[in-house]
Amino acid sequence: FPMFKRGRCLCIGPGVKAVKVADIEKASIMYPSNNCDKIEVIITLKENKGQRCLNPKSKQARLIIKKVERKNF
């Protein structure tokens, strides 16, 4: 679960409510920065099926964020 800061929001819209756990390759969390004032959770899917923005307010996103914060802090 990498964590990094960057400029400008990447996700168009809030994102999907959930992604099948079996489809998740990795999850990246982008914390608010000068140019993007919200947290963004980007899921990379297995088998080169692209990525999905996961709604940071969803239950699944909150679990992922918690897991990352436990690991990093």
Partner: nanobody
Framework: EVQLVESGGGLVQAGGSLRLSCAAS????????IGWFRQAPGKEREGVSC????????YYADSVKGRFTISSDTAKNTVYLQMDSLKPEDTAVYYC???????????WGQGTQVTVSS
């Protein structure tokens, strides 16, 4: 190779309409999220709309809500952005984005220019 080709832009008077198309190839269209974003000269890029098949959801930026409609034709692997009641401030180059995620600047498509005159 994933390819997204935008078309349908043009010059239109304020209050007019345009329909943009985003033709997708190089990936399966059964579980997709495709978005539109725009870049006006001297302005920040702006996410405009997104459609996602996995949860049948659509999103619209506040600036276009009630005027723009996003839709898709899975048989044609194409996503459309119907733009009605256009305003001069909608003038920009419009790009489509796979996964509803704005890619790094170097990998944007050619986009389609929309110019709204007053």
């Amino acid at each position: 190779e994933v390819q997204l080709v935008e078309s349908g832009g043009g010059l239109v008077q304020a209050g007019g309409s345009l329909r943009l198309s985003c033709a997708a190839s190089g990936f399966t269209f059964d579980d997709y999220a495709i978005g539109w974003f725009r870049q006006a000269p001297g302005k920040e890029r702006e996410g405009v709309s997104c459609i996602s098949s996995s949860d049948d959801s659509t999103y619209y930026a506040d600036s276009v809500k009630g005027r723009f409609t996003i839709s898709s034709d899975t048989a044609k692997n194409t996503v459309y952005l119907q733009m009605d009641s256009l305003k001069p401030e909608d003038t920009a180059v419009y790009y489509c984005a796979k996964d509803c995620i704005i890619p790094p600047i170097g990998s944007w498509g050619q986009g389609t220019q929309v110019t709204v005159s007053s």
